[in-house]
């Protein structure tokens, strides 16, 4: 990444398209949910990030290479009754017209009698929606992410059974203080009671339907996190995600 422009703009918390390239680490992670190389584990001889091209490139069709952005799916379809299926997703009632991969398997409503098939690890996502709003919209949120990952997700529960969705107050890292930046125009002493600007949500992947219909399922959350980062790079996320992490051995009550 030769550009001084990009050196100045990297890691300032905002995606600058001119720097949104592999050479510039996707603007230092600003375009990729803070993940500087989503393809780090991809051992293909191809530069798989350059092959998101609406055609199948088998050398990139592995979990580590993010399943070639699911471009190798033979029967890639869109959900026929999308509005209906969105409204009835994960409502504890099986709608067979929504029980397909493209419709998110009705949020597993038709698979309640099947054993769960959890991917190893936890997805930890920061999203710029306060917890109450995110929880209110959780079915749509989980459906949107599930559509990108071609599987089902659920909010993790802590040891007391509470949903692991926590208020997020923003970062006070050096990166966020670049160019003397402060998130608010208030003096430091007034920043003690910062307002909630988002949520940190802990998610699990349940592959119980994915493994029946596909061989492109995430065995762990690392590649799933990387795929979300890849969607961020492409600008195809429908929610204001800020960061994504994968924790393969996560504590149940971590905040």
């Amino acid at each position: 990444c030769q550009s001084q422009y990009c050196a100045d703009k990297a890691r300032d918390g905002i995606c600058d398209e001119a720097c949104n390239s592999h050479a510039c680490q996707w603007d230092g992670g600003d375009c990729s949910l803070t993940m500087e190389d989503p393809w780090a584990n991809c051992t293909s001889t191809l530069r798989c990030w350059e092959y998101i091209n609406n055609q199948c490139d088998e050398q990139c069709n592995t979990a580590e290479c993010l399943f070639d952005n699911f471009e190798c799916q033979r029967n890639s379809k869109t959900c026929k009754y999308d509005k209906y299926c969105a409204d009835h997703f994960k409502d504890n009632h099986c709608d067979q017209g929504c029980n397909s991969e493209e419709c998110g398997w009705d949020g597993l409503d038709c698979a309640s009698d099947q054993p769960e098939n959890l991917a190893e690890g936890t997805l930890i996502i920061v999203v710029l929606l306060p917890p109450e709003q995110l929880l209110q919209d959780s079915r749509s949120f989980l459906r949107a992410l599930g559509t990108l990952l071609h599987t089902n997700l659920r909010i993790k529960q802590d040891s007391q059974g509470a949903l692991m969705v926590y208020p997020y107050f923003g970062e006070k890292s050096a990166a966020m203080k670049k160019q003397k930046m402060t998130r608010r125009s208030l003096p430091e002493e007034q920043e003690q009671e910062q307002e909630v600007i988002g949520s940190k949500i802990f998610l699990e992947i349940d592959n119980r339907q994915c493994v029946q219909d596909s061989d492109q399922c995430f065995k762990n959350t690392d590649a799933a996190a990387a795929l979300l980062a890849s969607h961020a790079i492409q600008g195809t996320l429908s929610y204001p995600l800020v960061s994504v992490f994968s924790e393969l051995e996560s504590p149940r009550n971590a905040q």
Partner: antibody, heavy 122, light 107 residues
Framework: EVQLVESGGGLVQPGGSLRLSCAAS????????MSWVRQAPGKGLEWVSY????????YYADSVKGRFTISADTSKNTAYLQMNSLRAEDTAVYYC???????????????WGQGTLVTVSS | DIQMTQSPSSLSASVGDRVTITCRAS??????LAWYQQKPGKAPKLLIY???IRASGVPSRFSGSGSGTDFTLTISSLQPEDFATYYC?????????FGQGTKVEIK
């Protein structure tokens, strides 16, 4: 309904200061970037400054760098433009405009305020 | 800075005419180009983004095309409410820059 309302414009002498406000409503303020764009009387549009409220990242046009400061208060859903050392050539209608992409600076401005007039004259 | 040059600066047309406005960037802006419409005394309104995608609520008679350095805004059949000034804007590299505007007047 997404809405932006500017205020704070007025008449100021050269060398003086003014602070413009842009009150946002109808969306999650911290999720979207905000720019100030100005238009001198009878002239075209000129981008002035940008802020991403979540991270505080700021960008400026060379013509205002060192004189203008953009900021945001996420608790008030308001963006500000502090204008110091004002010059006659800063006379313009100032618009605040929301960028359409969540965390992407490289996005078009999809919602605009009605504008506030700043006149710099002795 | 990237210079944006619009042509023509002004044009006269009649209702029902097909109108084409061009915008040229001094270097590639890929497809990161927007078109705005502005009427006297009003704020600009987003018409087209990403060079060719119509913004929400924009009539289908407006279309955009191009990538790299050369872009076009076309109004397929001019309506009375379309008489206004049109600006292109690149949002690829900051500072974001606008064209000088094209005023569409009634013939």
């Amino acid at each position: 309904e997404v809405q932006l309302v500017e205020s704070g414009g007025g008449l100021v002498q050269p060398g003086g200061s003014l602070r413009l406000s842009c009150a946002a409503s109808g969306y999650t303020f911290s999720s979207y970037g905000m720019s100030w764009v100005r238009q001198a009387p009878g002239k075209g549009l000129e981008w002035v400054s940008y802020i991403y409220p979540y991270s505080g990242a700021t960008y400026y046009a060379d013509s205002v760098k060192g004189r203008f400061t953009i900021s945001a208060d996420t608790s008030k859903n308001t963006a500000y433009l502090q204008m110091n050392s004002l010059r006659a050539e800063d006379t313009a209608v100032y618009y605040c405009a929301r960028h359409s992409g969540y965390y992407r600076i490289s996005s078009a401005m999809d919602v605009w305020g009605q504008g506030t007039l700043v006149t710099v004259s002795s | 800075d990237i210079q944006m040059t619009q042509s023509p600066s002004s044009l006269s047309a009649s209702v029902g005419d097909r109108v084409t406005i061009t915008c040229r960037a001094s270097q590639s802006v890929r497809s990161f180009l927007a078109w705005y419409q502005q009427k006297p005394g009003k704020a600009p309104k987003l018409l087209i983004y990403r060079a060719s995608i119509r913004a929400s609520g924009v009539p289908s008679r407006f279309s955009g095309s191009g990538s790299g350095t050369d872009f076009t805004l076309t109004i397929s059949s001019l309506q009375p409410e379309d008489f206004a000034t049109y600006y292109c804007q690149q949002y690829y590299i900051s500072p974001w820059t606008f064209g000088q505007g094209t005023k569409v007047e009634i013939k």
